[in-house]
Amino acid sequence: QPPPPPPDATCHQVRSFFQRLQPGLKWVPETPVPGSDLQVCLPKGPTCCSRKMEEKYQLTARLNMEQLLQSASMELKFLIIQNAAVFQEAFEIVVRHAKNYTNAMFKNNYPSLTPQAFEFVGEFFTDVSLYILGSDINVDDMVNELFDSLFPVIYTQLMNPGLPDSALDINECLRGARRDLKVFGNFPKLIMTQVSKSLQVTRIFLQALNLGIEVINTTDHLKFSKDCGRMLTRMWYCSYCQGLMMVKPCGGYCNVVMQGCMAGVVEIDKYWREYILSLEELVNGMYRIYDMENVLLGLFSTIHDSIQYVQKNAGKLTTTIGKLCAHSQQRQYRSAYYPEDLFIDKKVLKVAHVEHEETLSSRRRELIQKLKSFISFYSALPGYICSHSPVAENDTLCWNGQELVERYSQKAARNGMKNQFNLHELKMKGPEPVVSQIIDKLKHINQLLRTMSMPKGRVLDKNLDEEGFESGDCGDDEDECIGGSGDGMIKVKNQLRFLAELAYDLDVDDAPGNSQQATPKDNEISTFHNLGNVHSPLK
């Protein structure tokens, strides 16, 4: 049947609408024309569109589509950007507090080792930060560096305090002896295992969040093809050429067009789903030695235990080192005797239990739950965009790309479109190069996440040491234990809190001059309050 004639024989309505898109009326015919030069809005009769108008409609359609896509992903994008920033900052805070705890332990228990110990501790935790942020540092090297640096100071200040400055060349011999004689027992190896496992997981977690941002940014800024532009123009604007200003596209037709336009983007869906599920698995495994908060905040205790180990073996060590490094010393010095009790820090860090206090762990789980609500984001995009652009409800009295119809029929619409361009062909082109690249990156991160994810129910690694130290299982209750053995063990209720700034901040720069007691001890630290409230509206 022929289309109804334009209600406005003068194209007046079309002119006034088009003027909003493009000031000036030189492109709009005053009365309907044959439109033989049109390539998209192919007329079945007189038309109020010109070739130039059609080009402008195509440009506008593509811009509209880009804006719709950006608004579709806005909530998801904000969720990931916000959390990536919050977690990165939280991890930095954990590192800073871990450094402060360790410095405080030295200041309280081994004042003669400061300020050198502060310097080595500071360097170690700087390396930890760099590693988390993606620098290529070997964790074993970091830990070896810390103990290599500490031992000469421990030996010359604690075990052999009579050594004069002229014997400083013994330091190199002591560095070598540290490894050869395993003077710290298996503590360095224990720390290497715990630190490398927890930091690896932390680093991949941050990398995954940053890749999530990159994925959204990539699809957010996709430039749609000319074919897609034509389809969108036909759907949104060709009705205007017939003077049908108030007619909306059929919903089913919109879905067909969107699936054609977004065929490449929808290919991300499979890898996006896998990304969220793999990230969930990783997060579920981030506890005990796979939780950097747990490991780093307990390091001061393990380091303390390692120094005690050296002191317990001081007599034997001094004799051996005396022989081994004799050429480096001008004379033999008597090893100072220290009663063992002096060096055992009986204090245990107590963190008051506060109901509903947010932990890093709970924050991670909350993020995963929110992300899971976006698991179908890419497959649902065509439908989402149609539901957020004007479409006719129930597919009645709507525009099918060629004419006003009483009821939309997908088959009829497809047949009608065949001579104009092939929807199937559009789908077969494959994704844009940028989409292919992001799919490759998703595949890579998914592989990494799968590699890192732990088997369910796995606990702290056993058999860490050949010398009888077990990193140990802390039982099945809700307490988690950190650190090495004996008095150094810290118990923290319901995991360590999502950290806010502590009351004190003992940095390497100001620590030597700081006179106040700065060891984490009973009642000194009340509670670590909720960082999430400060940083995030995502509650």
């Epitope: 760099l130 993606g134 290529d136 540092i137 070896n144 560096e145 190199e172």
Partner: antibody
Framework: QVQLQESGGGLVQPGRSLRLSCAAS????????MHWVRQAPGKGLEWVSA????????YYADSVKGRFTISRDNSKNTLYLQMNSLRAEDTAVYYC??????????????WGQGTLVTVSS | QSALTQPPSASGSPGQSVTISCTGT?????????VSWYQQYPGKAPKLLIY???LRPSGVPDRFSGSKSGTSASLAITGLQAEDGADYYC??????????FGGGTKVTVL
């Protein structure tokens, strides 16, 4: 006496390879990161490559990445630089340097005397 | 990686002071990465003068001092002596842990 002694330099044609060695003594070699730094005639210092104490991490300047390989043998207290696909612009005195630290670059507290590499046809 | 920026030359009479600047970016000097300074005589290997922005290795005279603020670092030589005539290089590293040197400053004692 802490010492570093480079060897292996000489005249080589463009496209060819050369291997530099650096023998270390007087310090615990396996505890420190090590570097190669070069200086073209009349020019400033240019960092070439670094390796961590265990050899677990290596780092390269963009200008040599893919062509040069740094390695170490802690049992022999020796640092190496394998230079492939040499170019005229690689002509320089190559210094071996010890880092203050073990895990990565910081400051170079001991330097060798350098070995001259000339790339010319 | 881009080099740090140093003035090509600086000069002063014996007893005077000379300050050499070294400007980097937010990804090297301006980050948490420390700056080191080296002295080099013609035909000789460089020698470490300052590390961690302001620390002097043993044997380096206290006439040499270092400082850092923001993306810039400085080396100050007070009470200039004839033997201070040499090339001076600053050095730092970036977040990829790749080392960056300054272009060098030639100090002339007049």
């Amino acid at each position: 006496q802490v010492q570093l002694q480079e060897s292996g330099g000489g005249l080589v044609q463009p496209g060819r390879s050369l291997r530099l060695s650096c023998a270390a003594s007087g310090f615990t070699f396996s505890s420190y990161a090590m570097h190669w730094v070069r200086q073209a005639p009349g020019k400033g210092l240019e960092w070439v490559s670094a390796i961590s104490s265990s050899g677990g991490s290596t780092y390269y300047a963009d200008s040599v990445k893919g062509r040069f390989t740094i390695s170490r043998d802690n049992s022999k207290n020796t640092l190496y630089l394998q230079m492939n696909s040499l170019r005229a612009e690689d002509t320089a005195v190559y210094y071996c340097a010890k880092d203050r630290r073990g895990s990565h670059a910081d400051a170079f507290d001991v330097w060798g005397q350098g070995t001259l590499v000339t790339v010319s046809s | 990686q881009s080099a740090l920026t140093q003035p090509p030359s600086a000069s002063g009479s014996p007893g005077q002071s000379v300050t050499i600047s070294c400007t980097g970016t937010s990804s090297d000097v301006g980050h948490k990465f420390p700056v080191s300074w080296y002295q080099q005589y013609p035909g000789k290997a460089p020698k470490l003068l300052i590390y961690k922005n302001l620390l002097r290795p043993s044997g380096v005279p206290d006439r040499f001092s270092g400082s850092k603020s923001g993306t810039s670092a400085s080396l100050a030589i007070t009470g200039l002596q004839a033997e201070d005539g040499a090339d001076y290089y600053c050095q730092s590293y970036d977040s990829s842990l790749r080392v960056v040197f300054g272009g060098g400053t030639k100090v002339t004692v007049l």
